[in-house]
């Protein structure tokens, strides 16, 4: 009588997550009487996957009808495969007894699960930084298998080279995660810039996944300030303008000070965007020169995005109050006690 053989023809089977896996097993004889069982892993810690004899295995079905006596095919199909199902599966023949006696095991079939990486999530720095500073962006993707994966970084379509990537765990696992940190040097023109993390994996059929982050979330472009005297009107009123330009984000508070005393505070809102994504804002004051004996020191104080205030001052010369319209005069840091009459912004 020939020796019983338990044949598992495939050494390995690779299946996409969500699909069904077929694990093949045939026996050369049905003698002696006794059940076939499927296990994942070997040794005392092995996990019972399917037992024809008893138990409830909702995801496992026999490929052939096990109730047919001439059936020597004990292959099984496992549905809805997940990365947690990866491992080596053994088809084992037992002789009926109390307990059942293990007679022979198949050589085992290694099931590997091809699982897609999750959509990459890109996160930027917690606080904004200004131009010329380097900020870090992190990209994370999880749950993929096998371990081999490619990650690239782009800024506005240009590939970046300053990044560090780790795939965890280092050893064998049912699924893996990738984490990459890229260092990006900011420029004043980066408000509309975007960083892209691109992940390529065998499960994606050449169609990589992308995660993006806008540099607008990471950058602060501090404003330029210029205070000018726009004109001397016929009614002895001087129009003083504070131009705040090329700033981002829009969160900005402007305060006019007359000789050190707060005159008016304004908040920027609903400003039109420049082509580069920055904003401009102009605020003006009308100063009645004839109502003052001394020069008036006007200060335009700008607090941008919670940063320390930036000041620019301008002195309105009362002693030399010309009655005709004058040309624009640049801001100075000298001035006297004067009070503004009117104000506005635009």
């Amino acid at each position: 009588e020939e020796e019983l053989q338990v044949i598992q023809p495939e050494k390995s089977v690779s299946v996409a997550a969500g699909d069904s896996a077929t694990l093949n097993c045939t026996v050369s004889s049905l003698i002696p009487v006794g059940p076939i069982q499927w296990f994942r892993g070997a040794g005392p810690g092995r996990e019972l996957i399917y037992n024809l004899k008893e138990g409830h295995f909702p995801r496992v079905t026999p490929v052939s009808d096990p109730t047919k006596r001439n059936n020597m095919d004990f292959s099984i199909r496992i549905s809805n495969i997940t990365p947690a199902d990866a491992g080596t599966y053994y088809c084992v023949k037992f002789r009926k007894g109390s307990p059942d006696v293990e007679l022979k095991s198949g050589a085992g079939t290694e099931l590997s699960v091809r699982a897609k990486p999750s959509a990459p999530v890109v996160s930027g720095p917690a606080v904004r930084a200004t131009a010329e500073h380097t900020v870090s962006f992190t990209c994370e993707s999880h749950g993929f298998s096998p371990r081999d994966i490619t990650l690239k970084w782009f800024k506005n379509g240009n590939e970046l080279s300053d990044f560090q990537t780790n795939v965890d765990p280092a050893g064998k696992s049912v699924s893996y995660s990738i984490r990459s940190t890229a260092r990006v040097v900011l420029t004043r023109r980066d408000v509309h810039s975007q960083v892209i993390c691109e992940v390529a994996h065998v499960t994606l059929q050449g169609d990589p996944l992308r995660g993006t982050a806008n540099l607008s979330e990471a950058i602060r472009v501090p404003p330029f300030l210029e205070v000018t005297q726009q004109s001397m009107r016929a009614d002895n009123q001087v129009n003083v303008t504070c131009q705040v330009t090329k700033f981002y984000p829009q969160r900005l508070q402007l305060t006019w000070l007359e000789n050190g005393n707060v005159s008016r505070t304004e908040m920027a809102s609903a400003l039109p965007e420049n082509k580069d994504g920055t904003y401009n804002w102009t605020s003006w004051l009308l100063v009645n020169v004839s109502a003052h004996r001394d020069d008036v020191k006007l200060t335009c104080q700008v607090e941008h995005d919670g940063q320390p205030a930036v000041n620019k001052s301008f002195s309105v010369k009362v002693s030399a109050h010309p009655k005709e319209q004058g040309s624009n005069t640049a801001a100075e840091n000298t001035g006297t006690n004067e009070r503004n009459i009117y104000g506005g912004s635009g």
Partner: antibody, heavy 118, light 107 residues
Framework: EVQLVESGGGLVQPGGSLRLSCAAS????????MHWVRQATGKGLEWVSA???????YYTGSVKGRFTISRENAKNSLYLQMNSLRASDTAVYYC????????????WGQGTMVTVSS | DIQMTQSPSSLSASVGDRVTITCRAS??????LAWFQQKPGKAPKSLIY???SLHSGVPSKFSGSGSGTDFTLTISSLQPEDFATYYC?????????FGQGTKLEIK
């Protein structure tokens, strides 16, 4: 349809012989372990004998040496040769098919009556 | 030989009742235990194998449990056609042996 039909029962004197037959249809008898089970009138069930797919045979203690189980693959039939019959062998004899991998009984014949009496 | 002991030997119940029959083996039989139903003048019918698996066509009101030496057969809601004699059987090793039977009668 899977079916077992016994025949060959009857009245026999103590010490006499009888050969029971079981004709199988709807399946290949040689692919299954096959059994004989008996039941005396008003009594419980008693397993008598079995033949495995490899031709191996088994008997309950009280019939060893007197009964012989066999099969004829060409006729898809099972037999029980009963010699040296005793009054205690009087019973309905059932032909039973053993289950696929664990030999649990699944298909029963309708039975044939054996009466051993002088 | 392995001895199989059923209890009770007889049982009276009403239609709709839930009944339980027990079977004890004289030694560990793993779960190689079967249950059969027999009506007068008829061949036995296979109900359950490996202690808890229902044969094809057997209604789910029949259920079996147990492992080792102690086993039970439960009929969840008795119908008139369920009044019969029930036998347990071990088939872990030869000679296969049956319990003495439990006669289920209408009260």
């Amino acid at each position: 349809e899977v079916q077992l039909v016994e025949s060959g029962g009857g009245l026999v004197q103590p010490g006499g012989s009888l050969r029971l037959s079981c004709a199988a249809s709807g399946f290949t008898l040689s692919s299954y372990d096959m059994h004989w089970v008996r039941q005396a009138t008003g009594k419980g069930l008693e397993w008598v004998s079995a033949i495995g797919t490899a031709g191996d045979t088994y008997y309950t203690g009280s019939v060893k040496g007197r009964f012989t189980i066999s099969r004829e693959n060409a006729k898809n039939s099972l037999y029980l040769q009963m010699n040296s019959l005793r009054a205690s062998d009087t019973a309905v004899y059932y032909c039973v098919r053993g289950g696929v991998w664990d030999d649990a009984f699944d298909i029963w014949g309708q039975g044939t009556m054996v009466t051993v009496s002088s | 030989d392995i001895q199989m002991t059923q209890s009770p030997s007889s049982l009276s119940a009403s239609v709709g009742d839930r009944v339980t029959i027990t079977c004890r083996a004289s030694q560990d039989i793993n779960n190689y235990l079967a249950w059969f139903q027999q009506k007068p003048g008829k061949a036995p019918k296979s109900l359950i194998y490996t202690a808890s698996s229902l044969h094809s066509g057997v209604p789910s009101k029949f259920s079996g449990s147990g492992s080792g030496t102690d086993f039970t057969l439960t009929i969840s809601s008795l119908q008139p056609e369920d009044f019969a004699t029930y036998y347990c059987q071990q088939y872990v090793s030869y000679p296969y042996t049956f319990g003495q039977g439990t006669k289920l009668e209408i009260k």
